[in-house]
Amino acid sequence: SEVEYRAEVGQNAYLPCFYTPAAPGNLVPVCWGKGACPVFECGNVVLRTDERDVNYWTSRYWLNGDFRKGDVSLTIENVTLADSGIYCCRIQIPGIMNDEKFNLKLVIK
C-alpha cells in the first residue's frame, strides 16, 4: 500500500523521495508522475531529471532538496483538492527492471 501524506488546500505539499547515488555526482534519471507507477517510466510526468540536472518540470511542481545528493523530494505549491491522489517517484537505475518505484498517496484536506 502507498504511504500517505497530507496537506491543506492552499498550502504546499511535500512528497519525500530519496536514493543514494553510486558515487558523488553519479546521478540516475528520476521522474515524478501523477498516478501509480506503471511498468516503465512515469505516467502524467510533472518533473524529470537526467544524469546532470532537472530537464523538465511543470508549474507548481518543484524539486525540494539537494537532488544532486539524492534528495529528489517533490514540492507541490498551493495545492487544491484536485491534487489529491497517487504520485509516482521513479529512480531509473540502468539495467532491466532495476528501477526503484515509490507510490505516495497525497490527501488534501
Epitope: 508549474s59 518543484w62 524539486l63 532538496g65
Partner: antibody, heavy 122, light 109 residues
Framework: EVQLLESGGGLVQPGGSLRLSCAAS????????MSWVRQAPGKGLEWVSA????????YYADSVKGRFTISRDNSKNTLYLQMNSLRAEDTAVYYC???????????????WGQGTLVTVSS | SYVLTQPPSVSVAPGKTARITCGGD??????VHWYQQKPGQAPVLVIY???DRPSGIPERFSGSNSGNTATLTISRVEAGDEADYYC???????????FGGGTKLTVLG
C-alpha cells in the same frame, strides 16, 4: 540574454524605509526562484532573502527577518525588497540573483544583477 | 547554525595551481557552489554542484567535495584570475543560503 537590473538604492536615515526593485528579462521569470544578496563595503557576500517562483514561499536571513519583505510581480517580471527599520549595518550593495532551473529554493545563483547601493546614515 | 570556513587569502605564481578550500561539517553531503568576484563587479558563478562548470568558464576551473572540505582548483593560473572567491551552500535545516567568508586570490609577480 538574461538581464537583471536593480534600482531603488540611495541614502536613508536609520529607522527609515526603502524599496528595491529588480527588473528581469531574457527568461521565464515565474519559473525561477529569486534571491537578494548583499555585500557591505569591504566585506563578503551575505544572503538576505529568497522567494519561490510563484511567490508563494519566502525565506529570510535572521538578520533581516521582521524588517525586510521580499515579493515579486510575475506579470511585470519584477522582484522587490521592502526594507523597513533600516540600520547602519544594512549599508551594502544589494544584488538580485536568479536561482537554478526546476528547484524550489534556487540552490545556487546562476545570474546576478550589477547591484544597487543602500547607505544608512544620519 | 552551519558555518563555511575559507582561508582569507591564497597566493600563487602565474602558471601554477591554486587551491581554495571551503570547510564545513560533512560538507560532502551538500552541494557546493563557487563564485568569482572582481573589484567593483558582481559575482560570477564558476562552479556549481561541486564540480560542474557553467558555459564560458575555462576548463582550468574545477571543483571537488568530500568529507569536511570542498575545494576549488584553478590550474595554470593567470593574472586575470586574481579575485575574491566564495563558496556557497543551501542549508535545508534552516532554509538559508550560506556563503563562506571569501578568499582573496593573489597572483604573484
Amino acid at each position: 540574454e538574461v538581464q537583471l537590473l536593480e534600482s531603488g538604492g540611495g541614502l536613508v536615515q536609520p529607522g527609515g524605509s526603502l524599496r528595491l526593485s529588480c527588473a528581469a528579462s531574457g527568461f521565464t521569470f515565474s519559473s525561477y526562484a529569486m534571491s537578494w544578496v548583499r555585500q557591505a563595503p569591504g566585506k563578503g557576500l551575505e544572503w538576505v532573502s529568497a522567494i519561490s517562483g510563484s511567490g508563494g514561499s519566502t525565506y529570510y536571513a535572521d538578520s533581516v527577518k521582521g524588517r525586510f519583505t521580499i515579493s515579486r510581480d510575475n506579470s511585470k517580471n519584477t522582484l522587490y525588497l521592502q526594507m523597513n527599520s533600516l540600520r547602519a549595518e544594512d549599508t551594502a550593495v544589494y544584488y538580485c540573483a536568479r536561482g537554478s532551473y526546476g528547484t524550489y529554493y534556487g540552490n545556487y545563483f546562476e545570474y546576478w544583477g550589477q547591484g544597487t547601493l543602500v547607505t544608512v546614515s544620519s | 547554525s552551519y558555518v563555511l570556513t575559507q582561508p582569507p587569502s591564497v597566493s600563487v605564481a602565474p602558471g601554477k595551481t591554486a587551491r581554495i578550500t571551503c570547510g564545513g561539517d560533512n560538507i560532502g553531503g551538500k552541494s557546493v557552489h563557487w563564485y568569482q568576484q572582481k573589484p567593483g563587479q558582481a559575482p560570477v558563478l564558476v562552479i556549481y554542484y561541486d564540480s560542474d562548470r557553467p558555459s564560458g568558464i575555462p576548463e582550468r576551473f574545477s571543483g571537488s567535495n568530500s568529507g569536511n572540505t570542498a575545494t576549488l582548483t584553478i590550474s595554470r593560473v593567470e593574472a586575470g584570475d586574481e579575485a575574491d572567491y566564495y563558496c556557497q551552500v543551501l542549508d535545508r535545516r534552516s532554509d538559508h543560503f550560506l556563503f563562506g567568508g571569501g578568499t582573496k586570490l593573489t597572483v604573484l609577480g
